[in-house]
Interface confidence: low
């Protein structure tokens, strides 16, 4: 039986797992490891500690489907819409740049429900708090070491974590990535930002005409969303949740500061945008060190890849 490890339980990892399962006819052992406490990666949904039904999308806010991908990925959209995982975005987002033919979708159960859908379909064994530290070749198999516990072995590994994390891995992988490939991987850059989720008591009113708003005039805050309103799941029994995304310059400046300091600065700026907000009953601040990819880079034009070398270890 082929044994496959996918590192990263985000969008790429979960969809990859589902596609591998769909397209493999024979027996297949699929494992998905993630360093975090839960799946989702940058498509993460946080819950209020007071009420797990009060949720906030701290990463991706909505899915934009361009005409090109509406055709190319039609089966994915059709499936997710049919299962109720996605719904068209019907609430107003102020300042959103809409191109002709684009359509937007939200995930009523939270953006991480997309990931959970694909992981469930894949039948993969999903392990959290598994931080990969080293990858070596042993008797034609990949031996993967993690921060705690014994190394494990797989026939195939798919790495879906951000490139800087791949480049930090130890072991044979460091020499199996050619210099040319390494340079191209190093060319991939990421922007950094913070996301802040605020959870409020049931019955709290946040009286604004929009579900989300892009801010252009604030050095700290780039986007604000009344998250339950954005997802069209407002309820008198469940308190509203608010999501704030910082600007990239702010994110870069305060990247190594404490979460508490960052949260305080964001609160101060939020008062200028939404004055008189009530006190939240819970907050969750998320640092996105690898938020988006302004410059993707691609591996091409390198001499033959050494990834396929078969090296026995050790006997």
């Amino acid at each position: 039986m082929a044994q496959v490890l996918i590192v990263g339980a985000g969008m790429t990892g979960s969809l990859c797992a589902a596609l591998l399962r769909r397209q493999t006819s024979g027996p297949l052992y699929l494992a998905v490891w993630d360093k975090a406490e839960d799946s989702g990666g940058r498509m993460t949904t946080a819950c209020s500690p007071h009420n797990p039904q009060c949720t906030a999308d701290l990463g991706a806010q909505y899915i934009t489907c361009t005409p090109h991908y509406a055709k190319k990925h039609q089966r994915f959209y059709d499936e997710l819409l049919a299962y109720g995982v996605l719904r068209p975005l019907s609430s107003p987002i102020e300042g959103m740049v809409m191109k002709e033919g684009d359509c937007n979708f939200v995930a009523p159960q939270g953006i991480s429900s997309i990931i959970k859908h694909y992981l469930k379909e894949s039948g993969a064994e999903v392990y959290f708090r598994h931080r990969v530290t080293q990858i070596n070749l042993r008797d034609d198999k990949w031996e993967v070491s993690k921060q705690t516990g014994s190394p494990e072995q797989f026939d195939l590994i798919v790495l879906t974590m951000p490139v800087p994390e791949i480049l930090q891995l130890q072991g044979d992988i460091t020499t199996l990535i050619s210099e040319c490939q390494r340079q191209q991987l190093e060319a991939v850059s990421y922007s950094s930002r913070y996301a802040l989720g605020l959870f409020y008591e049931a019955g709290t009113k946040i009286d604004v005409p929009w579900a989300g708003q892009y801010i252009t005039s604030n050095p700290c805050i780039r986007f604000v969303s009344i998250d339950n309103k954005k997802r069209n799941i407002e309820s008198s029994e469940i308190g509203p949740s608010l999501v704030i995304h910082t600007t990239v310059p702010f994110g870069v400046t305060y990247l190594e500061h404490s979460i508490e300091d960052v949260q305080e600065l964001v609160f101060q700026q939020l008062e200028n945008i939404l004055p008189g907000l009530p006190q939240p009953i819970a907050t969750k601040c998320q640092k996105w060190r690898h938020s988006q990819v302004p410059s993707a880079g691609v591996i091409l034009g390198c001499a033959k890849s050494p990834w396929m070398m078969a090296i026995g270890f050790p006997i």
């Epitope: 080293q134 070596n136 042993r138 008797d139 198999k141 070491s145 014994s150 190394p151 072995q153 130890q170 072991g171 044979d172 460091t174 020499t175 050494p306 070398m309 090296i311 026995g312 270890f313 050790p314 006997i315």
Partner: antibody
Framework: CQSLEESGGRLVTPGTPLTLTCTVS????????IYWVRQAPGKGLEYIGI????GTYYARWTKGRFTISKTSTTVDLKMTSLTTEDTATYFC??????WGPGTLVTVSL | AQVLTQTPASVSAAVGGTVTINCQAS????????LAWYQQKPGQPPKRLIY???TLASGVSSRFKGSGSGTEFTLTMSGVECDDAATYYC?????????????FGGGTEVVVK
């Protein structure tokens, strides 16, 4: 032709440090794990340690007396605090089963 | 530490006969199959016969057969020839982080009559 050859084995007195060298040809050390094994006269094979791109591991019994390091074409085994018990033929071997001919180390008063 | 116990320590075989050597590991070898068998003749380095418990190494006669998984392994030599007189070792690969990466069995001397 891919090969490994050990050198540096000789007669030494107890306590003398000694470094053995495994010189490889026909392949890159970047792509293979190399391990050291020894065999006392008339005895069985004993694992010493292994070096690979992720680092080195040693047999528990070595207790810090042995150090393995490598350059682009050689793998060294540095031995300290030698005793008569360390008298043996020392082999280096590649991860996929290719062994060198061995080099004899004799520790004697 | 990981221990490989090889039995018997010595065996005598007639030409054309069959010899079976057993190797028991104190804990499961890596991936349940990371066990190799070596043949060694006096004054020579060991020669790998079998790896991954049952895979025949390149250029080795199909008279040699490896089997087993986990902690119990067997090398079977059929149609024994004079040239098979040698000492045979099993070698196991283990999790480096929980002990020694590699361990060898004590060896089995095969005498061909």
């Amino acid at each position: 032709c891919q090969s490994l050859e050990e050198s540096g084995g000789r007669l030494v007195t107890p306590g003398t440090p000694l470094t053995l060298t495994c010189t490889v040809s026909g392949f890159s050390l970047n792509n293979y794990h190399i391990y050291w094994v020894r065999q006392a006269p008339g005895k069985g094979l004993e694992y010493i340690g292994i070096i690979f791109n992720g680092g080195t591991y040693y047999a528990r019994w070595t207790k810090g007396r042995f150090t393995i390091s490598k350059t682009s074409t050689t793998v060294d085994l540095k031995m300290t605090s030698l005793t008569t018990e360390d008298t043996a033929t020392y082999f280096c071997a590649r991860g996929d089963g290719i062994w060198g001919p061995g080099t004899l180390v004799t520790v004697s008063l | 530490a990981q221990v490989l116990t090889q039995t018997p320590a010595s065996v005598s075989a007639a030409v054309g006969g069959t010899v079976t050597i057993n190797c028991q590991a104190s804990q499961s070898v890596f991936n349940n199959n990371y066990l190799a068998w070596y043949q060694q003749k006096p004054g020579q380095p060991p020669k790998r016969l079998i790896y991954s418990a049952s895979t025949l190494a390149s250029g080795v006669s199909s008279r040699f057969k490896g089997s087993g998984s986990g902690t119990e392994f067997t090398l079977t030599m059929s149609g024994v020839e004079c040239d098979d007189a040698a000492t045979y070792y099993c070698a196991g690969s283990f999790d480096c982080n929980s002990g020694d990466c590699v361990a060898f069995g004590g060896g089995t001397e095969v005498v061909v009559k």
